[in-house]
């Protein structure tokens, strides 16, 4: 392994998964590396093999149990190490004492559906996936709507500062195709970040009623 610029980032999905990304400029693509997890108050140790996702980036998932099981709490600390093989030995390339609830990234919201659509508005609902009951209602959402002729990056962000798993989109254009995405973030955690965006939900507003002849 080459001593290039390195970065090791991990997030807990709040239930039973720690996802990690390791990047290192100048590292050889065939370098064999793994993430080792050593909790302070659990009887398990876990290892996952880092697999390449780009030229100088590797990723892996520490799967701690069934997807909806609560495997870690706010008092847990898990020491995470990146170990890379150098000849016959393993070398520590990165290390952190990982506090799961300071480093949260939830799964993308799922089950997006159109509840009701009209000519100028659309009511959409969704569900959160594999989110800890510890959060109670301490979640926020961001949503965006893709209009014809625009990109996702141009779409204005709508912020929902509470656990609200629905939205009523207004001032839409009749008989027009749109797409909608939403993401979620817990309020807790210094290094917590937004979930990935949900799969886009496509919908079409209803056409305007034809005016009467005069």
């Amino acid at each position: 392994a080459v001593n290039g610029t390195s970065q090791f980032t991990c997030f807990y999905n709040s239930r039973a998964n720690i996802s990690c990304v390791w990047s290192q400029d100048g590292a050889l693509q065939d370098t064999s590396c793994q993430v080792h997890a050593w909790p302070d108050r659990r009887r398990w140790n876990q290892t996952c093999e880092l697999l390449p996702v780009s030229q100088a980036s590797w990723a892996c998932n520490l799967i701690l149990g069934a997807p909806d099981s609560q495997k870690l709490t706010t008092v847990d600390i898990v020491t995470l190490r990146v170990l890379c093989r150098e000849g016959v030995r393993w070398r520590v390339m990165a290390i952190q004492d990982f506090k799961p609830f300071e480093n949260l990234r939830l799964m993308a919201p799922i089950s997006l559906q159109v509840v009701h659509v009209e000519t100028h508005r659309c009511n959409i609902s969704w569900e959160i996936s594999q989110a800890s009951h510890y959060f109670e209602r301490h979640l926020e959402f961001e949503a965006r709507t893709l209009s014809p002729g625009h990109t996702w990056e141009e779409a204005p962000l709508l912020t929902l500062k509470q656990k609200q798993e629905w939205i009523c989109l207004e001032t839409l254009t009749p008989d027009t195709q749109y797409e909608f995405q939403v993401r979620v973030k817990p309020l807790q955690g210094e290094f917590t970040t937004w979930s990935p965006w949900s799969q886009p939900l496509a919908f079409r507003t209803k056409p305007a009623a034809l005016g009467k002849d005069t």
């Epitope: 090791f8 600390i77 020491t79 520590v92 990165a94 290390i95 952190q96 004492d97 480093n103 290094f191």
Partner: nanobody, 126 residues
Framework: QVQLVESGGGLVQPGGSLRLSCAAS????????MTWVRQAPGKGLEWVSS????????HYADSVKGRFTISRDNAKNTLYLQVNSLKPEDTAVYYC???????????????????RGQGTQVTVSS
């Protein structure tokens, strides 16, 4: 704002010991990895030792291994460096520094710090 204040340095004879302290404020101390570096007169910064946020992982420069011990008391927001069997070549200003996240990289241990204290002078002389 982030503040790091070192203390505990002084003049000591070869073979002597000191305990350096670094009082941290302005951030959630146990969320961050910490490190000690030193600068000898006329020399560049030299990494000494690093420790993870909960103190479960430590690394040392070969020049101090077996003589220096890094530790932290997260309840007191304080980082320590116990320095034993001091040699004249340990004479330097000792600085504590915060890494910019909970992670540090033992192969490039000086990289990734974002705040450093003003330092405490350690002089080893008979």
């Amino acid at each position: 704002q982030v503040q790091l204040v070192e203390s505990g340095g002084g003049l000591v004879q070869p073979g002597g010991s000191l305990r350096l302290s670094c009082a941290a404020s302005g951030f959630t101390f146990d969320n961050y990895a910490m490190t000690w570096v030193r600068q000898a007169p006329g020399k560049g910064l030299e990494w000494v030792s690093s420790i993870t946020g909960a103190g479960r992982g430590t690394h040392y420069a070969d020049s101090v291994k077996g003589r220096f011990t890094i530790s932290r008391d997260n309840a007191k927001n304080t980082l320590y460096l116990q320095v034993n069997s001091l040699k004249p070549e340990d004479t330097a200003v000792y600085y504590c520094a915060r890494y910019s996240s909970s992670t540090y990289y033992p192969t490039t241990p000086v990289r990734g710090t974002d705040y450093r204290g003003q330092g405490t002078q350690v002089t080893v002389s008979s």
